[in-house]
Interface confidence: medium
Amino acid sequence: AAPCPDACCPHGSSGLRCTRDGALDSLHHLPGAENLTELYIENQQHLQHLELRDLRGLGELRNLTIVKSGLRFVAPDAFHFTPRLSRLNLSFNALESLSWKTVQGLSLQELVLSGNPLHCSCALRWLQRWEEEGLGGVPEQKLQCHGQGPLAHMPNASCGVPTLKVQVPNASVDVGDDVLLRCQVEGRGLEQAGWILTELEQSATVMKSGGLPSLGLTLANVTSDLNRKNVTCWAENDVGRAEVSVQVNVSFPASVQLHTAVEMHHWCIPFSVDGQPAPSLRWLFNGSVLNETSFIFTEFLEPAANETVRHGCLRLNQPTHVNNGNYTLLAANPFGQASASIMAAFMDNPFEFNPEDPIPVSFSPVDTNSTSGDPVEKKDETPFGVSVAVG
């Protein structure tokens, strides 16, 4: 093949090599950019900055090499448009630092930074951690900080991500209340902070106030939908990002629904209970307290992470006609109590038959392993029985 006279020449089916001395000062308008998976750049002393716009359109890029060039600065968002990047070689440039944000969101298998005049500071704490944890092939490079010694020896005691404290009301919050949350941010070199409110939707009217180091958030006219929703405060410095999520508990009364009994592995009387705080439950059978046993017991389904309602069953193991009757579920929390009742018929009474009818006879083997006995009542110092707490 004839030698390529251009600044950048094709290499393989989807690669590009730019090695002609001093031919590039930016990566704009590279030929065939949208299909490139590999880009190799060398000897480009005028290529000093790598920014977001430089790699726009390189969505398929897997390998990027910029070596023996004049690269001084890589923007924190430089690789936003190259999410598939897995190998990044920036060796033998003029880089003094590289932000943790630059590699955030990438799944880099290899990161090469040797031969750069790195300056040891907290901004490289993330890289030191990669070295400690054996990530991206960093340990093998034995990275040095210019005039300061090995990166591995950099003191890091003061290199922490921001510390966040979110103040939430400890008293109950009622539907319709306004709630003030405050996020206190501490730490060195604070850069940005804010709230993530994606889960809130119509749960409240949101008003943000203040800025670093104290961010305010007013949730006005809250609804019960706010329960179990994350409100997240975040902050960033040159070391990294910190997030703290809190939930605001909006109190509302207990409610309960009962549904027709269904036969599954056992019989099940399905129920749904709601309320904040999570209600206590109690079952009645024909108006009297139903003491749960291994044959009749409450069972909950796995709760959804983002809602307060709980679903479950009163499980009945092989119920007979003596279990036929009226089942009532009581639910109580400090803001109200609720009940629901349902009639359940599991089996006809075999002793109620017309004398004219033939008498049914059945034979069953003797169960030699059966045991019988009353449920054991556990005593304690309270004068009360036990009811189920949901939550």
Epitope: N170, A171, S172, N249, S251, P253, A254, P277, A278, P279, S280, R282, L330, A332, N333, P334, F335, G336, Q337, S339, D380, E381, T382, P383, F384, V386, S387, A389
Partner: antibody, heavy 123, light 106 residues
């Protein structure tokens, strides 16, 4: 034997603050909810504050919400009531009372009460 | 809030007689609880969840009722039963007490 001993009451001017304490013994404090109830000079009982067994949930009636704060230190078996912006109508005997075991069992009331501590708000 | 009204305000009876104390709620409640208070003492739990006897309470005390009307009955009064009795609901927030019924010796 279950014992609840309140302290910290006294005479305070309107707008002032007081902190009541309740030392608990004879039961596993951290497994019970706790409340404060007051009795006015006219002998009416009024529930004032509630706290869950771990201290994460607190409830107050509107008459004291925003002024009173209930808290607990399970390592010291002690319940507290911080009372700010006190008013003449807060004058009462304040009782601490033990609530239900097994977390928040909302069917059951307060079963044991202390002997009370007197708070007088007057100028 | 749910208002609890106790009647009568004062009940004068003799030892051995039957005492019936009433408590009426302004809205329906699931349960009622009853306390006894003697002069200079803290309230003492008598009846919980409408009809259950608290620990150490004699069987002459009983409770009944549902919805808005509840009753505390003392079947045969003993001298130590003369005191003030309070009903209490914790079915609806805020939790409230009745104003009390004073049971005195006739």
């Amino acid at each position: 034997e279950v014992k609840l001993l309140e302290s910290g009451g006294g005479l305070v001017q309107p707008g002032g603050s007081l902190r009541l304490s309740c030392a608990a013994s004879g039961f596993t404090f951290s497994t019970y909810t706790m409340s404060w109830v007051r009795q006015t000079p006219g002998k009416r009982l009024e529930w004032v504050a509630y706290i869950s067994k771990g201290g994460g949930s607190t409830y107050y009636p509107d008459t004291v919400k925003g002024r009173f704060t209930i808290s607990r230190d399970n390592s010291k078996n002690t319940l507290y009531l911080q009372m700010n912006s006190l008013r003449a109508e807060d004058t009462a005997v304040y009782y601490c009372a033990r609530g239900a075991m097994y977390g928040n069992d909302f069917f059951y009331p307060m079963d044991y009460w202390g002997q009370g501590t007197t708070v007088t708000v007057s100028s | 809030e749910i208002v609890l009204t106790q009647s009568p305000a004062t009940l004068s009876l003799s030892p051995g007689e039957r005492a019936t104390l009433s408590c009426s709620a302004s809205s329906s409640v699931s349960y009622m609880h009853w306390y006894q208070q003697k002069p200079g003492q803290a309230p003492r739990l008598l009846i919980y969840t409408t009809s259950n006897l608290a620990s150490g309470i004699p069987a002459r005390f009983s409770g009944s009722g549902s919805g808005t009307d509840f009753t505390l009955t003392i079947s045969s009064l003993e001298p130590e039963d003369f005191a003030v009795y309070y009903c209490h609901q914790w079915s609806s927030y805020p939790w409230t007490f009745g104003q009390g019924t004073k049971l005195e010796i006739k």
